[in-house]
Amino acid sequence: SEGRKTWRRRGQQPPPPPRTEAAPAAGQPVESFPLDFTAVEGNMDSFMAQVKSLAQSLYPCSAQQLNEDLRLHLLLNTSVTCNDGSPAGYYLKESRGSRRWLLFLEGGWYCFNRENCDSRYDTMRRLMSSRDWPRTRTGTGILSSQPEENPYWWNANMVFIPYCSSDVWSGASSKSEKNEYAFMGALIIQEVVRELLGRGLSGAKVLLLAGSSAGGTGVLLNVDRVAEQLEKLGYPAIQVRGLADSGWFLDNKQYRHTDCVDTITCAPTEAIRRGIRYWNGVVPERCRRQFQEGEEWNCFFGYKVYPTLRCPVFVVQWLFDEAQLTVDNVHLTGQPVQEGLRLYIQNLGRELRHTLKDVPASFAPACLSHEIIIRSHWTDVQVKGTSLPRALHCWDRSLHDSHKASKTPLKGCPVHLVDSCPWPHCNPSCPTVRDQFTGQEMNVAQFLMHMGFDMQTVAQPQGLEPSELLGMLSNGS
């Protein structure tokens, strides 16, 4: 992005690039390879128990591993700020034996005008200011350093970047007399990367830019810019990849149209259209060139921006994402669902599945949920018998074998995992749903009936009797 130099203050130059990327210097730890689970697939529990016991026995060797927390670092360049002008920052847990870096962008919706930004500032100030951030955070899910919670990348250097710019990580405007708030999401990412170069990122082999919800969309908007930034700073050997969780939205027609009054009721296209202007939002250059001036909002939608990206990106998206339903004015309040709404929801799943057909690395379970990768139980959901950490491991392998996303999938190691069953929670490994009145867990059959699905219509396409289907669903098959 232009003007990047203005963010570099004297005495804050990144370290010079290493002379060679070949082998680590003597005495430096050699990066471990990703675990290949293929041989142990049938006996995963016993294998994980062995990994856990090995990890626990090695813990005393490394005091740093005993502390699960990521530690807060406010940016040294205090001109890169949160909405209220307080310095942005990041939480870091180094893993000195690893050349993998995971940078996670937090989510948390957005605001797009003075009124709803004021309301956000009054009720969600942690998402607009760093003034009260805790000194440490615990890494969970993909940010966990425990192999049993994070079989994928437990040994990586973990970075959590709090979302305090309310701009879907796209803004490039500072606070001024005219602007009540700063929107610097895109600049925060650039500055965090720059400061991390001095903390070991310079020796990285892989940088995985991940994020959930607005952070997931932030990945799509920023991954190529991070790769370009590292290249310009003299680190072309760092492989930059993206992992976008729950940030792949559709600019579809709302179930019930409402005026654009606040964050929740505003149609996604209109919210982003207004937001881009308010935030001075920036989008990936190659995507921007595909649309006319004033039409940059298109690049916030995964299926439009993805084909323009150069970095490999893995897309994780629930087929029935709750945030998508929220902006579409679908509020599932526990009342039985009418047919019109049921068809709308089914169609949403169908449309989403369609947008992922040309995304080679994707994981899309047919569940009604939102966000997954920093949940502690992110390993539980499976698509076609494959868990998300396993799919990510397969993706790593496919990228290891060819620097571009491999067209021929590895045998027994799938990366394109999109559920094909057509209704919410038809995948028995979906997160548990509870009855909103009683709080009781519901099985899939109860949930579908609660959603107003007629078991006859559901069973027919599967070539089953309703009673057979109910039996299967109740048994979690």
């Epitope: 004021d118 309301s119 500032y121 009720t123 969600m124 100030r125 606040d262 509020h331």
Partner: antibody
Framework: DVQLVESGGGLVQPGGSRKLSCAAS????????MHWVRQAPEKGLEWVAY????????YYADTVRGRFTISRDTPKNTLFLQMTSLRSEDTAMYYC?????????WGQGTSVTVSS | DIQMTQSPASLYVSVGETVTITCRAS??????LAWYQQKQGKSPQLLVY???NLADGVPSRFSGSGSGTQYSLKINSLKSEDFGSYYC?????????FGSGTKLEIK
């Protein structure tokens, strides 16, 4: 030290009016959203009204919309709640509260009784 | 409007025990939830905001958890000063409704 002090409560006839005040000190009043919350005798908390920082946008609970008006006098660090067409069900302890992340400071409350 | 269903309505417990109070929203509130404690004749006090963040000065025996529509407040090894009423409140669009409250009483 942050302080919120409500005043203006008392006995009011049904259909009557009352204006509550909340004097704020110990913080930059203009930088925080301000709320009124009430609690009927032996009952739970009920959110009543909210005025944002900055733009001063205003929101009400359905039970009071059209009858109550929230306002703030920023130079005087004071929040107000003008109540009209009062009903017996408006009888409660009225609290003013400041918000940033949740309602982080509350006043001691002022009691309003609507009765003939 | 979003409804908040809090349970249980009352709890009889002894000092030293651990209790969990739950709050269910009628739709996803994306972790925009606060918990308050109110002692008899006093104003409420903020305990937790953003579903999991402890407010200043709140002892670490209190913890908030949850996401989506399901949230809970856990109090480990209860102290005598923890008895009183507890309320949840959402901040996901007005009206910012409260739960009906949970009264914690000494057994």
């Amino acid at each position: 030290d942050v302080q919120l002090v409500e005043s203006g409560g008392g006995l009011v006839q049904p259909g009557g009016s009352r204006k509550l005040s909340c004097a704020a000190s110990g913080f930059t009043f203009s930088s925080f959203g301000m709320h009124w919350v009430r609690q009927a005798p032996e009952k739970g908390l009920e959110w009543v009204a909210y005025i944002t920082s900055g733009s001063g946008a205003i929101y009400y609970a359905d039970t009071v919309r059209g009858r109550f008006t929230i306002s703030r006098d920023t130079p005087k660090n004071t929040l107000f709640l003008q109540m009209t067409s009062l009903r017996s069900e408006d009888t409660a302890m009225y609290y003013c509260a400041r918000s940033a992340d949740g309602l982080d400071y509350w006043g001691q409350g002022t009691s309003v009784t609507v009765s003939s | 409007d979003i409804q908040m269903t809090q349970s249980p309505a009352s709890l009889y417990v002894s000092v030293g025990e651990t209790v969990t109070i739950t709050c269910r929203a009628s739709e996803n509130i994306y972790s925009n939830l606060a918990w308050y404690q109110q002692k008899q004749g006093k104003s409420p006090q903020l305990l937790v905001y953003g579903a999991t963040n402890l407010a200043d000065g709140v002892p670490s025996r209190f913890s908030g958890s949850g996401s989506g529509t399901q949230y809970s407040l856990k109090i480990n090894s209860l102290k005598s000063e923890d008895f009183g009423s507890y309320y949840c409140q959402h901040f996901w669009g007005t009206p910012f409704t409260f739960g009906s409250g949970t009264k914690l009483e000494i057994k």
